[in-house]
């Protein structure tokens, strides 16, 4: 077969080919930020000629054109400046209201490099209607000027702009407009990952965190899909595998879906996951009817087995058939469970469609969506039982209208998105399921996104101050208790001057709490073995502080999971009859277990906890410490089995002021405290300029660095004695 010519450069931009120069290959242009390619893509035809999708005239030279944002068509009850036909990237538009009207939304908006305005639609409202004035987004025209109960407004976009959101909205009895705000956008515009992740997350995060079965959630964040304790979520992942998706992009689709699956199983809900790949025909890799759909490892392995070559004989995009296979799955499940049963009616359904183009065969996908809505009996009362997310990737041949038609329309939410590329998709799935904003005490959740602050990443981390100076660190283990080291308290029992500094979203300095009571392990006595030539002994180096008030849970303050508790068991997704021993076997399951602690400056540092034989060789080094232990005969006199050991190879060593802080691991996107920093043979902060400077020990140092952490699995009786009514402990 002939290949297509190679004279396809774009001035100022670059291009990629999905299958080289061979027929069927899709050439995709890209431009620097703030510019967009025209045309966006070309397809190599079997005749050996390039064809531009949707183009009527002959091949024109590809160019990068400047992105522009749409201008307001009309702005009611106010004025806007400057008045331009469209606005360049970085350009501003300002809004002011006439007397008697109050401005809602953003008074100034800026055109962003993706052709989208920042901020929110500006509306001049006098509060007269049953519903608030729904406004007119930039580039839109609205018909309908009455905002009473039952009144409707309709929207369309000017010139060649594309409408996303609801073209028609109705003022409902609760004073809220139905559907979602319409936005008019340039056909070439796309969404930034940092906008999509929270928008997607709003719909998802509470759905996942709300079923924390150990306590009822008091507050819900926006509209989140509520899954009651008995509830169940069916998640359907639909992955486009058509010809225009390159093999590499398909891998990223798979990886993103895996991320999603991994995250979703880390929450305390009952979930079944279906995996469907599609091109001309759909292929069901995992059905919700299969028991394995509830098992994360099975779902992930079926995803990993998804093969790009599965669809090489039919390379069209049949979105209808993919959605129809979801419908058929639902139909079968309804038959199995019984249409009238609670078991069927209480299942929530979320469909995520990942595609790179418009459907080009099999009929309108909207028909399949209508069937799905019908079988699930989606009406105003049952609107929360279905969410369809339509995510277009690649912004080249993606059809905004179609995506918008497929995505759910819910007030204050968006369900249709177009991302620039698969990398952006990966970023979104990495950050969308962030339950760190939940207000209940769900444990071990840290914000893992790249732009999160240190405190948001480790929201359990607290600082302990005897007076003005910081002394030790600790970890929130509930909304009122902090776990720390006993050796921090060497001034007797007067803790009236002590303060605990807890993260607070309103202040970068955190919030100070007084201590109601300090429970210091009675077994701790640093001088206990002085007569044996052990000048400092740190056995039982553990303490609990009860704060004078409860901490309000937030992105910056949240407890870490303590192993051997029901809370940790849920986070680990372990079966109900699990024991403390099971947790130890799962968390400390290797000779060298990667773990972390938090540095003085708040950053997360890495260590490796040595277990088994490696623990012995890790601890042996203590015999070389002649100052503290001048005539030590048995290392185990100093390093008892209460201690975890780290500090070998590339490990960071904690500083003295990091004592009491959590030693923690990450499992299934949740964090578990297995130890607390106690003592060590090397202090990397000693005499440093500030909290940001640490010195690595020279390789020749004798003894080499070693660090010892109280092992919480060895402190169970004491923890249970004092926290029995705070946490739900599992049998030993």
């Amino acid at each position: 077969a002939p290949s297509c010519p190679q004279n396809v450069n774009i001035s100022g931009g670059t291009f990629t080919l999905s299958h080289g120069w061979a027929p069927g290959s899709l050439l995709t242009y890209s431009c620097p930020q703030g510019l967009y390619p025209s045309p966006a893509s070309r397809l190599c035809k079997s005749s050996g000629q390039w064809q531009t999708p949707g183009a009527t005239r002959s091949l024109s030279k590809a160019v990068c054109k400047p992105v522009r944002c749409p201008a307001p068509v009309s702005f009611e009850n106010g004025i806007y400046t400057p008045r331009l036909g469209s606005y360049p990237v970085g350009g501003n538009v300002s809004f002011e209201c006439e007397d008697g009207f109050i401005l809602r939304g953003s008074p100034v908006r800026q055109c962003r490099p993706n052709g989208m305005w920042d901020g929110e639609t500006a509306v001049c409202d006098n509060g007269a209607g049953h519903c608030p004035n729904p406004g007119i987004s930039l580039g839109a025209v609205r018909t309908g000027f009455r905002f009473g109960h039952g009144d409707k407004v309709r929207y369309r976009c000017s010139s060649n702009l594309v409408l996303t959101g609801s073209s028609e909205r109705e003022c409902q009895g609760n004073g809220v407009w139905s559907g979602t705000e319409p936005i008019c956008r340039q056909p070439y515009s796309y969404d930034f990952p940092e906008d999509v992740a929270p928008a997607l997350g709003t719909s998802f995060s509470h759905m996942l965190g709300a079923t924390n079965p150990t306590q009822k959630t008091k507050e819900s964040l926006g509209r989140k899909i509520q899954i009651q304790r008995s509830g169940h979520l069916n998640l359907y992942l639909l992955l486009d595998c058509s010809q225009s998706v390159s093999e590499n992009d398909f891998l990223i689709f798979k990886e993103s879906a895996s991320l999603m699956v991994d995250r979703i199983f880390s929450f305390e809900i009952n979930v079944s996951v279906a995996i469907i790949t599609f091109a001309s025909e759909p292929k069901v890799l995992m059905s919700v009817l299969n028991d394995n759909s509830r098992d994360m490892t099975e779902v992930i392995s079926s995803l990993e087995n998804a093969n790009y070559k599965d669809h090489e004989n039919g390379t069209g995009t049949n979105t209808y058939a993919a959605l129809n296979s979801v419908y058929l799955m639902m139909n079968n499940q309804m038959r199995l469970l019984g249409m009238e049963t609670m078991a069927w009616q209480e299942i929530r359904h979320a469909i995520i469609l990942l595609t790179d183009g418009k459907s080009n065969m099999g009929g309108s996908p909207k028909t399949a969506v209508d069937h799905i809505r019908e079988i699930l009996n989606i009406n105003q009362k049952r609107n929360d039982y279905l969410d369809i997310y339509a995510i277009g990737v690649g912004k080249l041949d993606v059809d905004w209208r179609e995506l918008n038609e497929l995505g759910s329309k819910k007030d204050g939410e968006r369900h249709a998105f177009i991302l620039q590329d698969t990398k952006a998709l990966h970023q979104v799935f990495e950050h969308m399921l962030d339950v760190s904003k939940l207000t209940d005490t769900i444990c071990g959740v840290g914000n893992m996104s790249a732009n999160a602050s240190d405190q948001e990443r480790t929201p359990w981390h607290v600082t302990i101050k005897p007076k003005s100076q910081e002394t030790c660190r600790g970890a929130l283990i509930s909304d009122q208790w902090v776990l720390t080291a006993a050796h921090c308290f060497r001034d007797g029992n007067d803790h009236s001057l002590w303060r605990v500094n807890v993260g607070d979203p309103k202040s970068q300095w955190g919030k100070e709490f007084l201590i109601e009571k300090a429970v210091i392990s009675p077994g701790f006595d640093v001088f206990a073995k002085k007569n044996q030539g052990i000048l400092e002994f740190y056995g039982d180096d553990i303490a609990l502080l009860k704060l004078a008030q409860k901490v309000k849970m937030s992105t910056h303050a949240r407890p870490i999971c303590l192993p051997c508790t029901m809370e940790a068991n849920l986070a680990l997704r372990r079966p109900q009859g699990s024991t403390c021993r099971d947790h130890e076997n799962e968390l400390l399951n290797k000779q060298s277990v990667p773990a972390h602690f938090v540095a003085l400056n708040g950053s997360k540092l890495n260590i490796n906890l040595k277990m088994g034989v490696e623990w012995t060789s890790c601890a042996e080094v203590v015999s070389q410490e002649k100052t503290m232990f001048p005539n030590l005969t048995d290392v185990r006199e100093v390093v008892t089995d209460q201690f975890l050991c780290s500090g070998t190879q590339e490990d960071e060593s904690p500083c003295k002021g990091e004592s009491g802080g959590a030693v923690f691991l990450e499992r299934r996107f949740r964090f578990f405290q297995v130890g607390l920093v106690s003592w060590g043979l090397y202090n990397p902060c000693l005499g440093s300029a500030d909290k940001n400077s640490r010195k690595r020990a020279p390789r020749s140092k004798v003894p080499p660095p070693r660090d010892f952490h109280i092992n919480l699995f060895r402190m169970q009786p004491w923890l249970r004695q004092h926290l029995g009514d705070v946490l739900n402990f599992l049998p030993l």
Epitope: E470, V526, E536, M628, C655, K656, G657, S659, C685, K691
Partner: nanobody, 122 residues
Framework: QVQLVESGGGLVQAGGSLRLSCSAS????????MGWFRQAPGKEREFVAS????????EYADSVKGRFTISRDNSKNTLYLQMNSLRAEDTAVYYC???????????????WGQGTLVTVSS
Amino acid sequence: QVQLVESGGGLVQAGGSLRLSCSASGHTFRSYYMGWFRQAPGKEREFVASISWTGGSTEYADSVKGRFTISRDNSKNTLYLQMNSLRAEDTAVYYCAADYSGDFLLSDLDSWGQGTLVTVSS
């Protein structure tokens, strides 16, 4: 906070010895890590030695290891620095410092003495 007063500085020949003392007022001396720092003319203040609140562990800067010894007497609320084999480069003002955490971060220390000058002539 602990009030600190250094003494014992002076002029000494290279190879000679000096013993610096630091007396602390305040009943909490025994619960503080104590340390010595020094500052040579035109240079940054640098860490010399520290001792834990228990007296059980000590740390030294590489430049003084084997020559200087830090010790404390909690019953007298006093910290000592025994300096042997002194060199011209040991010339500096020596400061005593108290730190509850034991890290002796220069940015965080709020208990310093006024310093005592040690001059080593060659």
